[in-house]
């Protein structure tokens, strides 16, 4: 089937487009929703910075780059893209800077090429364990997504549902095994204290996972043998005391990973020595000259590189009767 | 790494058809939109026309009447056939992709075959 | 037709030297243009994508600017294996077109 041969770029300037769940209506070949910009040689459509309060309905079918940034879209409903003939062709979908708070069950359904998803830098308050997996089934259908851009969706603490945020993002990650062809997971800047431990190990397609800027103090619990495609793993500014041996063991078996550690409070005392030996010997670790202590206050700011076992020590714990009040 | 490599034949007579076949080894065939594009001696680029995964084609206007470009997937490759060629046709030919992954917003062609050097002459 | 007009048409300069090379369109192309190297006997090779992207593997001495009608490739200090041709292309509107090319020699 042939495509016209030539598309004009369209910038429309009417007022915003109300969506319906379901547009019954194909799109007619040429058309741009109002306030986007529409590119048919490029498979995009822009609509950013316009304050849509909804998807538009009258996407183009070629659509294979949608761009909905900078919006008030506030809610994505179930069915927010689904169209009939649907949209094919729709491969990336970027929603950040939106101001979503919830995205229900089923938000991303109909959408069978979509590759790539980006909610970052959006308060979601209310994110469905089903929303990337479109039902509640034990096994649901597999997502086609490949990468998840997830950085900085952490609402603000007043506007917290009262319940756990770690729990309520890995949920929606794990619910119905939809996600086992994913490669990119970015969770950056969420405020996370700790990870849930079955996470990682449901993700085995796992190539890239980003979780720089949280509030992570440890990994004990977190098991990373699965991830045998992992390459990379970001866990800069973090909250970071020591990583263990057996997280240690596990990285280093782990045959194409680079792991990041910069900024974290590393604590070099006794429990610091197979770590700092490990450091010594590894390659797996990108910019390891950089890392150095925060704690105790006597080791601020030393190299772990250079640090021997002579260097780490822990305080001797008292026995009961000598300690002071 | 998506490789190109293209052959076709190198000397035509004025009228004759021009056919090039490229064949693409080492990445995803869907993910691409795959091109061709021409250059004449000492000259610059023009762009003849591109093909998608699911065969919607496009062509430059300039020489729709005269084009047709076709995949085979079975075969990971993609063709160009040009009829009626005269010497403004002698070029070098290269097939060229866009679109680096699938999910990715990538707007370049990234991935180039060698270049077939075509000369029309009588 | 889009069309895209580079300029200058040769641009003389010296290794270490900083090179500025404009294209401008007949109409907006938005962010959809790319930039190519091309050397003799080569096919060429994408430098920059989506207006300020570099692609993979490019120096970080190569930088695109610019949205709309007008663009900028700068190299900001010219390696011996710089000196090339250098041709804008958009994506915006069918057909796709590039510009007349930049060679950049050596003074």
């Known amino acids: 089937s042939s495509s016209p041969t030539s598309s004009a770029s369209s910038f429309s300037s009417s007022a915003p487009f109300l969506a319906s769940a379901v547009s019954a209506q194909p799109p007619l070949p040429d058309q741009c929703p109002a306030l986007c910009e529409c590119s048919e040689a490029a498979r995009t459509v822009k609509c950013v910075n316009r304050n849509l309060t909804e998807v538009p309905t009258d996407l183009p079918a070629y659509v294979r780059n949608l761009f909905l940034t900078g919006n008030q879209l506030a809610v994505l409903p179930a069915g927010a893209f689904a169209r009939r003939p649907p949209l094919a062709e729709l491969a990336a979908l970027n929603l950040s800077g939106s101001r979503l708070d919830e995205v229900r069950a089923g938000a991303f359904e109909h959408l069978p090429s979509l590759r790539q998803l980006d909610l970052s830098h959006n308060p979601l308050a209310d994110l469905s364990p089903f929303a990337f997996s479109g039902s509640n089934a034990s096994v649901s259908a597999p997502s086609p997504l490949v990468e998840l851009i997830l950085n900085h969706i952490v609402p603000p603490e007043d506007e917290r549902q009262n319940r756990s945020f770690e729990g309520m993002v890995v949920a929606a990650l794990l619910a119905g095994r939809a996600l086992q062809g994913l490669r990119r997971l970015e969770l950056a800047s969420n405020h996370f204290l700790y990870l849930p431990r079955d996470v990682l190990a449901q993700l085995p397609s796992l190539r890239h996972l980003d979780l720089s800027n949280n509030s992570l103090v440890s990994l004990t619990y977190v098991s990373f043998r699965n991830l045998t495609h992992l390459e990379s793993l970001h866990l800069e500014d973090n909250a970071l005391k020591v990583l263990h041996n057996g997280t240690l063991a596990e990285l280093q078996g782990l045959p194409h990973i680079r792991v990041f550690l910069d900024n974290n409070p590393w604590v070099c005392d006794c429990h610091m020595a197979d770590m700092v030996t490990w450091l010594k010997e590894t390659e797996v670790v990108q910019g390891k000259d950089r890392l150095t202590c925060a704690y105790p206050e006597k080791m601020r700011n030393r190299v772990l590189l250079e640090l021997n076992s002579a260097d780490l020590d822990c305080d001797p714990i008292l026995p009961p009767s000598l300690q002071t009040s | 790494q998506v490789q190109l490599q293209q052959w076709g034949a190198g000397l035509l007579k004025p009228s004759e058809t021009l056919s090039l076949t490229c064949a693409v080894y080492?990445?995803?065939?869907?993910?691409?939109?795959w091109t061709w594009i021409r250059q004449p001696p000492g000259k610059g680029l023009e762009w003849i026309g591109e093909?998608?995964?699911?065969?919607?084609?496009n062509y430059n206007p300039s020489l729709k009447s005269r084009v047709t470009i076709s995949v085979d997937t079975s075969k990971n490759q993609f063709s160009l056939k040009l009829s009626s060629v005269t010497a403004a046709d002698t070029a070098v030919y290269y097939c060229?992709?866009?679109?680096?992954?699938?999910?990715?917003?990538?707007?370049?062609?990234?991935?180039w075959g060698q270049g077939t050097t075509v000369t029309v002459s009588s | 037709e889009i069309v895209l007009t580079q300029s200058p048409a040769t641009l003389s300069l010296s290794p270490g030297e900083r090179a500025t090379l404009s294209c401008r369109a007949s109409?907006?192309?938005?962010?959809?243009l790319a930039w190519y190297q091309q050397k003799p006997g080569q096919a060429p090779r994408l430098l920059i994508y989506?207006?300020?992207n570099r692609a993979t593997g490019i120096p970080a001495r190569f930088s695109g600017s610019g949205s709309g009608t007008d663009f900028t490739l700068t190299i900001s200090s010219l390696e011996p294996e710089d000196f090339a041709v250098y041709y804008c292309?958009?994506?915006?509107?069918?057909?796709?077109?590039f510009g007349g090319g930049t060679k950049v020699e050596i003074k």
């Open positions: 060229a992709g866009w679109f680096g992954e699938l999910y990715h917003y990538y707007y370049g062609m990234d991935v």
């Open positions: 080492g990445g995803s065939f869907s993910g691409y939109y």
């Open positions: 093909i998608d995964h699911s065969e919607s084609t």
């Open positions: 109409q907006s192309v938005s962010s959809y």
């Open positions: 989506d207006a300020s």
């Open positions: 292309q958009q994506r915006s509107n069918w057909p796709l077109t």
